[in-house]
Structure formats: C-alpha cells, structure tokens
Interface confidence: medium
C-alpha cells in the first residue's frame, strides 16, 4: 500500500477546522475490516486518531479529531482536526497497514491574522519640530511572530531606534508592540506595517503630525 | 565585489521544465532578500519572484503563480527558480537580482548578466 | 500594461535637462519609497537612484530623484552620449504584495 499526503504545509487559522489529507490506493475487493490506519504526532508518536479492527477508534486527542467514515473505503484517511489551536501545530503522521504498511508526515502550520494597528504618540500635545517623539504601534492576537517595519510619509523606511517587543498571551497568539523614536520635522507621516509571514498579511497603521491637531 | 551568476537557461517545449541557479558571492547571502526579474527580447523588466532571507516568506508575479517556484540553499549561497508548465510568453532573459533591504523586497542594488530562456516548439 | 506608467520615449541634446516621469497609485508610490534603475544597451539593470532621491556611490550627481504623492520623476542635467539607455521605476506594492516596474523610458540623445 502506498501512501500519499499533500507536500505543502496545511494553513489553518486559529478556531477553524483543518483537514490534513492523506490517500491510499485500495485493492479491488479491499474491505475496512482489513485497515489499520493511525494518525500520530511525528514527533512524540502520541495517538491522534486510529480506525483498526473494522471500526473507528475515535480520537485520543482532545476530543477535536475525526475521520471520514464514509470515504475510507474509497481510500481517504483524511483526519479532520477542528477548531484549531496554537498548540496543534506540527507534524502529523498518517500510517495505513492492510496487508503491508506504509505512512507520510503532513505538516500543520497555524495562523492568525494580526488586528490593524494602533498608533499612540508620546507626547501627544504641544509639538515642535525638533522634539523627540516615541511612537508606539501596537497590534494583537496574531501567529506566528509578526514582522515589523516603519517608513516615513514618503515611504523610506525607518530603521534607527525601533524597539519591537512580543509577548504570546494564554493561547499562544502574540501581541506586538513596536516603539519608533524620532526626531519631528515641520510635517511627518509615520507608518508602521505589521505583516503575518505566514498569512503574509500586512496590517497598516500611520500617525501624522503636523503641530496641529494629530491624525490617526 | 558581490557577484550574482545565473546559469540553467535554454530552450524548452511549451508544457516543458527548467530549473534556473543563481550562485552569489562577495557578500553574506543569507542576510538579504533575493528576486528574479525578466526581460522579455525588446520588453520591459517584470518582476517574477522573491525570496526573503530564511527562505520562509516568498512572492510571486500573478503571471507566474502555481507555475514557479522560488527557494534558496543559504549553505550553497544559490538562489533558485523552478520553472514548470512553460509558455511561449515566459521567453526572456532571467536577471537575479539582490536586495539591498534585509528581511522585504524593496529595491535591488546588484544584478546579475542574465541567463535566457526560450520556450518554443 | 505595467502598474506604473511611464513615458516611452524621451530625447534631449548633450548638456540639456531632461525629466522622466512615473506615476503609480496609493498601494505603491503612494506608501513606498521609489527607486530607479539604468539599462544600458545589451546589459543589465544598473542601480541608479533608491528611496525616491538618493544616489548610490559612483552614480553622478546629474542624476536627481523626487517624489510626490503617487507620482515620482528622475531629472538627468548636462545630458551626455553616454546617458542613453533604457530607464525603469520600481517599487513594491502593497496590494499586490510585490514588486512592479514602470514599463520603461527609451531616452535618446540627440546629435
């Protein structure tokens, strides 16, 4: 029996269901009281999910996994892995045994896409040109890391005196949170774009200070 | 001196494959974004695919979407471009081209001399 | 037909000003800086201005660059034989998530 799953990385978003494909091809006269199929973690050979002794085993993880009864016979041992988390990401193997054996790794990758940023400005009041700002770009619940990158309002980016922190709150997404310092001209756009590598997403923010009343 | 040397062009059937090399030196390969640009005989320059600096990030030109594929080998300071299903319109000179921004694509400051690729029956 | 447009064809007399223009849109030039590159005949793209108006070194100081709102322009002073070639504006886009080329200036100089 040859085994066969997607090459590519399966994508999923946080709290979404994912499906990690995996085939073989049956025998004529193959019945499912002859499958053993299994889905194990790569990595730590923890049970997932198994289908033996002509019956569906059910999940031995989380209580979130699920095959498809009705297409197995037909040779899909496809693994339904639902409402998807942080933690789920990784290496799936899927093994199939009916006279011989064979088994492929499929890799989940999870995503969450990042909040469009808020932009806070230190001072806030009383601008000169001249003076020294801090602007903070802050943007939320996204996986994995974000990139961060600052550009002016002519589009030149920014790259003295930015601080980029990220912290992952209980569910494993990351808040980031960006701190640009720069010295104001007479007028300035300042931009910060929060990119998911994975999603490659891009969140946009900007702040502009004219010495008059600030837009965000 | 930074030197980016392109090599794998030729001629190929329409429907064919090519896999274009890029061998870089003179400077830390793995710290910058790279691209291949093409140049159509007597068109424009068209932005094909990059690739950041891990491999992890790639774009591609709608053109060539699910048909290329971009990736780098940072051990071997080679930067590749897997060409599959080719048509007639792919025939071009394929530049590599480094960036001068680490981690996105934003403006290529070295370029190599090309390496043509022809697709005809 | 290129995201950013750009005039065909451009001609001037040796020691005359001449200005390429780019216009783009709010996803590109708008949001990113502009860089411009120099093709000489039969060899590669060349580097020849980057963020909007800097020049890398050994590029001469005829060469300028500016930028405003989504459009952008490269002005060549003291036009010399030497300077013809084909020039390109780039930029990334932010919609498109890549990189887009103007579609090229043929500049030709004259006598």
């Known amino acids: 029996v040859e085994v066969q799953v997607s090459e590519d990385p399966v994508v999923a978003l946080v709290d979404t269901d994912a499906t990690l494909r995996c085939s073989f091809s049956p025998e004529p006269g193959f019945s499912l009281a002859q499958l053993n199929l299994i889905w194990q973690l790569t990595d730590t050979k923890q049970l997932v999910h198994s289908f033996t002794e002509g019956r569906d085993q059910g999940s031995a993880y989380s209580n979130r996994t699920a095959l498809f009864p009705d297409l197995l016979v037909q040779g899909n041992a496809s693994l339904r892995l639902q409402r998807v988390r942080v933690t789920d990401e990784g290496s799936y193997t899927c093994f199939v045994s009916i006279q011989d054996f064979d088994s492929a790794a499929v890799s989940l990758q999870v995503a969450a896409p990042y909040s469009k940023p808020s932009m806070t400005l230190e001072p806030n009041k009383d601008l000169r040109p001249g003076n020294m700002v801090t602007i903070t770009c802050s943007s939320y619940q996204g996986y994995p890391e974000a990139e961060v990158f600052w550009k002016d309002g002519q589009g030149v980016p920014l790259t003295g005196n930015v601080t980029t922190s990220q912290m992952a709150n209980e569910r494993g997404l990351f808040d980031v949170h960006s701190v640009l310092r720069v010295v104001l001209g007479a007028n300035g756009t300042y931009s910060c774009l929060v990119r998911n590598p994975v999603l490659q997403q891009d969140a946009h923010g900007s702040v502009t200070i004219t010495g008059q009343p600030l837009t965000f | 001196e930074v030197q980016l040397l392109e090599s794998g062009g030729g001629l190929v059937q329409p429907g064919g494959s090519l896999r274009l090399s890029c061998a870089a030196s003179?400077?830390?390969?793995?710290?910058?974004?790279m691209s291949w640009v093409r140049q159509a005989p007597g068109k424009g320059l068209e932005w094909v695919s990059g690739?950041?600096?891990?491999?992890?990030?790639?774009y591609y030109a709608d053109s060539v979407k699910g048909r290329f594929t971009i990736s780098r080998d940072n051990s071997k300071n080679t930067l590749y471009l897997q060409m599959n299903s080719l048509r007639a319109e792919d025939t071009a000179v394929y530049y590599c081209?480094?960036?001068?921004?680490?981690?996105?694509?934003?403006?290529?400051?070295?370029w190599g001399q090309g390496t043509l690729v022809t697709v005809s029956s | 037909q290129s995201v950013l447009t750009q005039p065909p064809s451009a001609s001037g007399t040796p020691g005359q000003r001449v200005t390429i223009s780019c216009s783009g849109s709010?996803?590109?030039?708008?949001?990113?800086?502009v860089t411009w590159y120099q093709q000489l005949p039969g060899t590669a793209p060349k580097l020849l201005i980057y963020?909007?108006?800097k020049r890398p070194s050994g590029v001469p100081d005829r060469f300028s660059g500016s930028k405003s709102g989504t459009s952008a322009s490269l002005a060549i002073s003291g036009l010399r034989s030497e300077d013809e070639a084909d020039y390109y504006c780039?930029?990334?886009?932010?919609?498109?998530?890549?990189?887009?080329f103007g579609g090229g200036t043929k500049l030709t100089v004259l006598g």
């Open positions: 081209a480094k960036d001068a921004w680490i981690a996105r694509l934003l403006l290529f400051d070295y």
């Open positions: 003179g400077f830390t390969f793995s710290d910058y974004a």
């Open positions: 690739i950041s600096p891990g491999g992890s990030n790639t």
């Open positions: 709010s996803s590109n030039i708008g949001s990113n800086a």
């Open positions: 963020y909007n108006n």
């Open positions: 780039g930029t990334w886009d932010d919609s498109l998530s890549g990189y887009v």
